[in-house]
Interface confidence: medium
């Protein structure tokens, strides 16, 4: 038997002999910005380098004692966790420690900045293999905070950062709110969210995936054979910087939004028991528990998606929300939501040379999100194309015309405050796949991509009378690029992505007194990449 | 008591090597902007992170903090440069008093100041 | 106090694999805390390998990675230590020897102390590598 | 690996006399040590553990000391059935046994 949080990482086919890849995350460095560590432990003697990096603020309380096993204990738990002899997750990593939190657990914005800034200064110093940086450690929003995350993140380097211990949104917290960091939420041997205490783990679209982080058994600094169960979204996080280190160590050229991506391909999905988090939290909290891949060898054909959440807008009428790819990522649908289904639908539209989506809040709305559905799409070109209303009975339509372009994504965007019921053709033409329908009185906007060897298929469910939710899902090899409802009234809340299936949520019937003319169809847009599919067929 | 010595020496430096005028006036229209933690707990106040704008140079980010220097001493203010920041982002980290944020916020190449805020082990 | 009772001696050819049996009997015993010690004839001891309590997983002394697996059946009692790929310096008495784990709580968590300290071994089991 | 060196190698006394048998580790080991006392034929017997606490059931005269790189098994006063080899054992990292003190008769 292993730990229960190292089999929960370990895919099946491991799970009998040997529960990782052999090379264990040894072409990778891992930094770990935390206390003082214990760095001869027999689990971690001779992985971790403690640098001679030290900023931290005073203890606070004039009778507080430094006890060096006490100051140690949360530095060398976790990096046991990441890479411990016995108990952890890459056993071949090295490490290198810096201190920026005191012997009660305590540090400084500042602290941690001079901490990021010396790391780079390392890495230009020195050039080495991958690197990933582990922030076991939480504050309040902060700005300047988030930029050095992201100045980092744009060097190459793969920054993984604990949720916080707040049962609270993550978006509050810093680095657990900046995009480009890797940022990770805790759950039990149960696959429930870890409480903690009257708290827990944070949750909401800040966080990206989840991982084991309760009853976690890793080195204590009490003696060098010691080991001691902790909590906490840092255990979390270490055990995500672990697997981000064994799969950098089996692609070394893999980029911060291909990892990402990976991570989430390989997370398992749906387990979590999401009744825990606030009801409001609970559509943009990620439903993944982080895996290591079933194989070293990478999964290059796949063609890998992801949704992000925009901030919600606010209630005002002219609120909008923006929703954003990462700079590697390519934005190939766009979509809404609103839980008073007061909205004006999304369109994606160009910003700084990118495309991004946007979504529009109505009169008396309680506000908007914006949904953006982000892939890895190499050498692609996409482009959006608009048709405004139709005014017409037969509804508004748009497709690529482009040769070679495909359909990856349908949005609608409209001015006035209320869609009237309208029925469009649910079913569009034969030999039309690459068209968007919609309202008569909205504008419908198709992204278009043209990248080697895209093929995308339209697959639609349509229930005839109204459900609070209509799914369609894409098929083995298939991968959802685009999700959006049909039609596009007023009792539609909104349609996103969870992982591979198309989620559309209508208004309570009991509560609109719809009729049961008004069906609801989901429209899943799902692609495939044959020239990603090939060329990893001839690296093989 | 050496320690503030040792500033005071720094300031009178400062003192000299600048001029009165202000060189350098920041440019129009751009409005730096002051940030603090929302967990008033976890608020640092007297300790600040002076964020300049992203193609600032180091030689710059150590002018505008000497800047900063000498025109709080002539308000009779005692500051202290912890660190300045480049390779990540261009800035100081500077021990003053918040009385002197206005001040600060109109230094050219300023972008935003933030306060310090604690962080903690999770 | 707890008897560890080894199985018999094994002659083996070189290039098989002996597989060696450590049997509990009286008190509590905690099949997981075992180690393996061998002592070539005339030698010293040499600790080859043990199961960690608190993990669960085996800990194998370098030299012999890769060439030894150790196992423990809750159910009997019984802990196993098989050798593979045996050379004539192999020929050896393999102990099976009991070590400490020690369970405290500390700041609201439990600290589990493994040390290797070995209190109750069994009578050894002497295994010759002939052809 | 941490390496063991034990001193002497064998040494020759009398019923009564005082002997020390030294221990040094190639790193500091804290006082991870135990010493073991080993007869013809039998499997060994733990004495001390933690470089200085006596194992229960076992004579007084056994007494150990020491911490970091140095240890140290005293007899106060050599028995009889006190003839037999003696090995230290250092846990501080994966086991590591010292090659032996052979205790003779003189």
């Known amino acids: 038997s292993i730990p229960w949080n190292l089999e929960r990482i370990t895919p099946p086919r491991y799970r009998a002999d040997e529960y990782q890849p052999p090379d264990g995350g040894s072409l990778v460095e891992v930094y770990l910005l935390d206390t003082s560590i214990q760095s001869d432990h027999r689990e971690i003697e001779g992985r971790v380098m403690v640098t001679d990096f030290e900023n931290v603020p005073e203890e606070d309380g004039t009778r507080f004692h430094r006890q060096a096993s006490k100051c140690d204990s949360h530095g060398t738990h976790l990096a046991g966790v990441v890479s411990g002899r016995d108990a952890g997750v890459a056993k071949g990593a090295s490490m290198r420690s810096l201190r920026v939190l005191n012997c009660q657990g305590k540090g400084t914005v500042s602290g941690t900045l001079i901490g990021l800034e010396f790391i780079r200064k390392s890495q230009l110093v020195q050039p080495v293999g991958p690197l990933v940086v582990l922030l076991p450690l939480a504050g309040g929003y902060s700005r300047v905070l988030n930029a050095a995350c992201q100045r980092l993140a744009r060097a190459g380097v793969v920054l993984v950062t604990a949720a916080g211990n707040f049962r609270d949104d993550a978006c509050l917290y810093s680095p657990a709110s900046a995009p480009e960091v890797i940022t990770v939420g805790a759950t039990n041997a149960q696959d429930q969210p870890v409480t903690l205490g009257t708290l827990g783990t944070n949750f909401g679209r800040c966080v990206d995936l989840f991982a084991p982080g309760e009853d976690i058994i890793g080195a204590s600094s009490d003696c060098s054979t010691c080991f001691v169960s902790q909590s906490g979204t840092s255990q979390a996080a270490a055990h995500v910087a672990g697997i981000a280190a064994m799969m950098l160590s089996a692609e070394p050229e893999l980029t911060l939004a291909e990892l990402r991506q990976r991570l989430i391909h390989f997370s398992a999905k749906d387990v979590i028991n999401e009744a825990w988090f606030p009801e409001d939290q609970r559509v943009l909290t990620p439903n993944l528990v982080a895996a290591l891949p079933p194989s070293t060898h990478g999964a290059g054909w796949q063609l890998f998606c992801r949704t992000v959440w925009s901030a919600h807008s606010g209630p005002t009428r002219m609120a909008t929300a923006i929703a954003r790819c990462a700079p590697d990522e390519e934005l190939l649908s766009c979509s809404s939501f609103s839980r008073s289904g007061k909205r004006r639908g999304e369109r994606m539209e160009a910003q700084g040379g990118k495309l991004v989506c946007r979504a529009h809040n109505a009169f008396g709305g309680e506000g908007v999100y914006a949904i953006a559905r982000c892939c890895l799409l190499p050498q692609a070109n996409c482009s959006v194309h608009t048709a405004p209303p139709a005014e017409a009975s037969m509804g508004t339509r748009v497709h690529c015309h482009q040769q070679g372009h495909v359909l990856t994504g349908c949005s609608s965007h409209w001015e006035v405050e209320d869609l009237g019921t309208h029925k469009p053709p649910v079913l569009r033409p034969r030999g039309q796949p690459n068209q968007c329908v919609g309202h008569r009185e909205a504008s419908i906007h198709a992204s278009c991509c043209h990248a080697p060897g895209l093929e995308c298929k339209v697959k639609e469910h349509g229930i005839p009378a109204p459900q609070e939710q209509v799914t369609v899902a894409c098929e083995e090899g298939w991968t959802l690029t685009g999700c959006s409802a049909l039609p596009g009234t007023s009792h539609v809340l909104g349609a996103y992505a969870v992982d591979n299936t198309c989620v559309v949520r209508s208004r309570d019937v009991s509560t609109t007194g719809s009729t049961s003319e008004e069906a609801v169809t989901a429209v899943a847009i799902c692609c495939r990449s044959r020239h990603l599919a090939q060329a990893s067929q001839e690296l093989q | 008591q050496e320690d503030e010595d040792g500033d005071y020496e720094e300031l009178v430096l400062a003192l000299r090597s600048e001029e009165d005028g202000l060189a350098e006036a920041p440019e129009h229209g751009t409005t730096a902007t002051f940030h603090r933690c929302a967990k008033d707990p976890w608020r640092l106040p007297g300790t600040y992170v002076v964020v300049l704008k992203e193609e600032t140079h180091l030689s710059q980010s150590e002018r505008t903090a000497r800047r900063l220097q000498a025109q709080a001493a002539r308000r009779g203010y005692l500051t202290k440069i912890l660190h300045v920041f480049h390779g990540l982002l261009p800035g100081f980290l500077v021990k003053m008093s918040g009385d002197l944020l206005e001040l600060a916020l109109k230094l050219p190449h300023v972008d935003y100041i933030e306060e310090d805020s604690s962080v903690f082990a999770q | 106090q707890v008897q560890l009772v080894q199985s018999g001696a094994e002659v083996k050819k070189p290039g098989s694999s002996v597989k060696v049996s450590c049997k509990a009997s009286?008190?509590?015993?905690?099949?997981?805390?075992i180690s393996w010690v061998r002592q070539a004839p005339g030698q010293g001891l040499e600790w080859m390998g043990g199961?960690?309590?608190?993990?669960?997983?085996?800990n194998y002394a370098q030299k012999f990675q890769g060439r030894v697996t150790i196992t423990a059946d809750e159910s009997t009692s019984t802990a196993y230590m098989e050798l593979s790929s045996l050379r004539s310096e192999d020929t050896a008495v393999y102990y099976c020897?009991?070590?400490?784990?020690?369970?405290?709580?500390?700041?609201?968590?439990?600290?589990?102390?493994?040390?290797?300290?070995?209190?109750?071994w069994g009578q050894g089991t002497l295994v010759t590598v002939s052809s | 690996d941490i390496q063991m060196t034990q001193s002497p190698s064998s040494l020759s006394a009398s019923v009564g006399d005082r002997v020390t048998i030294t221990c040094r580790a190639s790193q500091g080991i804290r006082s991870a040590l135990n010493w073991y006392q080993q007869k013809p034929g039998k499997a060994p017997k733990l004495l001390i553990y933690n470089g200085s606490t006596l194992q229960s059931g076992v004579p007084s005269r056994f007494s150990g000391s020491g911490s970091g790189t140095d240890f140290t098994l005293t007899i106060s006063s050599l028995q009889p059935e006190d003839f037999a080899v003696y090995y230290c054992?250092?846990?501080?990292?994966?086991?590591?046994f010292g090659q032996g003190t052979k205790v003779e008769i003189k």
């Open positions: 020897a009991r070590h400490y784990e020690i369970q405290i709580g500390r700041y609201g968590m439990n600290v589990y102390y493994l040390m290797y300290r070995f209190a109750s």
């Open positions: 054992q250092q846990f501080d990292g994966d086991p590591t």
């Open positions: 009286g008190g509590t015993f905690n099949s997981h805390a």
């Open positions: 199961i960690n309590p608190i993990l669960g997983i085996a």
